[in-house]
């Protein structure tokens, strides 16, 4: 027959063709992992199943952003009776199953961490053939990429009056803490704008206006490292014009 | 029966070339990474390059000793591993394996039997 | 790159004693409970054949006196009862990062 439930590992409603009571459909995953950006992580998942010595087709699916509805970054499949899940997915080469799906692991290695990666995942499986069932996490695990600074873009731009700002964006994870430093300047923290909408990672500050020709410098500093860039100001004095 | 079969090797000069073939059997070849692994003479053990599968763009690795001198390469429809050996010195002297890695592990679950490049003057 | 040592180089044992063999790692090599190190057997003239993955899963065909343990940085193999036919050579692996890198090896000797 066939019942539905709230499991309580992932509190999601799912539906079962019930065929034991001895296991139920549940999904281990830890809520969070941690891991450097350029680097490897491991994310884990474990799960139960009712369907005992199921040896039939399946397929591993992993999906980042929302359960259900996201996008796949990992597919592969398994033969009846075969141990080898066959890659059908893997976005950019990166994401390599680790686990046995047959023995209930379909934990997953990501290579080569960029701050972009920094989202939820969240594993599924499917069974096909005489029993059709599957699920998914519906909490997932959350991977936490962390990465030392990097400057990536600083500039010198006109504004009004003949005037000029500078800008320096950085990324990194914790968000960088940004200061400016430059003729007449020491060190300042300047305007920081951080970090910006839709853009998590990336932390922006301003010199609104640079009143000496020179060299300034931009430092991105977190608890991982820093980084700096400079760039130079002269002004061709008698003339409205700027050589950065 | 999972069959890994090395040939190419012999005696070279430095400064010359080799190609190294193993031919596969026994399994899909398609499904797994390859690799080759090399021993010196009385030396333990020593990864020298890897070719993924076509899911992993046939993407390639180095050791640092062989990079830019070595070439993997893979033909799935001869279900067959290359090394293009060139620049070849007297430290590439080795029993050169072909090895079969799973694409989730980077471990070598079959080897051949190796085949013997030995640079000398 | 990762440098693995093993120890002790030599082991001198009797068929039948426990061998235990040692495996270090330069840095971790354990991401979220996996132990990304690998254990290898050779004898005189053959191939390398895959004993252990992952620190402690049996590969196939592997009898079941072999058995790895250890996480971070220090690893072990160990043979329960030493058969005649396991006095050889064994190497640890790590595939934590690349370029991929073996220990110098633990002979494994009659006593």
């Known amino acids: 027959f066939v019942r539905t439930k709230i499991d309580t590992t992932e509190n999601l409603l799912n539906t079962e063709v019930h065929s034991s009571p001895a296991q139920r459909w549940s999904m281990q995953v830890p809520p969070e992992v941690s891991a450097e950006a350029g680097d490897a992580a491991v994310l884990p998942c474990t799960f139960t199943h009712p369907h005992r010595h199921y040896d039939g087709p399946l397929t591993a699916i992993w999906r980042a952003g929302e359960p259900y509805a996201g996008p796949q970054v990992f597919r592969c499949a398994a033969a009846r009776g075969s141990e080898l899940c066959q890659t059908a997915l893997s976005l950019h080469g990166r994401f390599r199953l680790l686990g046995n799906p047959r023995r209930n692991d379909l934990s997953l290695r990501v290579e080569r961490l960029a701050l972009a990666d920094d989202r939820r995942y969240f594993c599924r499986v499917e069974f096909a053939g005489d029993v059709h069932d599957r699920y998914e996490s519906r909490h997932g695990v959350r991977l936490h990429v962390t990465a030392a600074p990097r400057i990536v873009n600083i500039s010198v731009l006109p504004s009004p009056a003949h005037a000029f700002r500078a800008l320096c964006t950085a990324e990194g994870e914790p968000p960088p803490a940004l200061a400016w430093s430059g003729p007449a300047l020491g060190n300042s923290l300047a305007a920081v704008r951080s970090p910006r909408e839709g853009h998590g990672h990336l932390v922006t500050a301003e010199l609104p206006a640079l009143t000496h020709d020179g060299r300034y410098t931009c430092t991105a500093a977190n608890s991982l490292g820093r980084s700096e860039a400079s760039v130079y100001l002269f002004r061709f004095h008698g003339a409205s014009g700027a050589s950065t | 029966e999972v069959q890994l079969v090395e040939s190419g090797g012999g005696l070279v000069q430095p400064g010359g070339s080799l190609r190294l073939s193993c031919a596969a059997s026994?399994?899909?070849?398609?499904?797994?990474?390859m690799n080759w692994v090399r021993q010196a003479p009385g030396k333990g053990l020593e990864w020298v390059a890897q070719i993924r599968n076509k899911i992993y763009t046939y993407a390639t690795f180095y050791a640092a000793s062989v990079k830019g001198r070595f070439t993997i390469s893979r033909d799935n429809a001869k279900n067959s591993l290359y090394l293009q050996m060139n620049s070849l010195r007297a430290e590439d002297t080795a029993v050169y394996y072909c090895?079969?890695?799973?694409?989730?592990?980077?471990?070598?679950?079959?080897w051949g039997q190796g085949t013997l490049v030995t640079v000398s003057s | 790159e990762i440098l693995m040592t093993q120890s002790p180089a030599t082991l001198s044992l009797s068929p039948g004693e426990r061998a235990t063999l040692s495996c270090r790692a330069s840095?971790?090599?354990?991401?979220?409970?996996?132990?990304?190190i690998h254990w290898y057997q050779q004898k005189p003239g053959q191939a390398p054949r895959l004993l252990i993955y992952?620190?402690?899963n049996l590969a196939s065909g592997i009898p079941a006196r072999f058995s790895g343990s250890g996480s971070g940085t220090d690893f072990t193999l160990t043979i329960s009862s030493l058969e005649p036919e396991d006095f050889a050579l064994y190497y640890c692996?790590?595939?934590?990062?690349?370029?991929?890198?073996f220990g110098q090896g633990t002979k494994v000797e009659i006593k």
């Open positions: 992952r620190a402690s």
């Open positions: 692996q790590q595939s934590r990062k690349s370029p991929w890198t």
């Open positions: 026994g399994f899909n070849f398609n499904d797994y990474f």
């Open positions: 090895a079969r890695s799973l694409t989730g592990g980077d471990y070598f679950d079959y």
């Open positions: 840095q971790s090599v354990t991401i979220s409970g996996y132990s990304f």
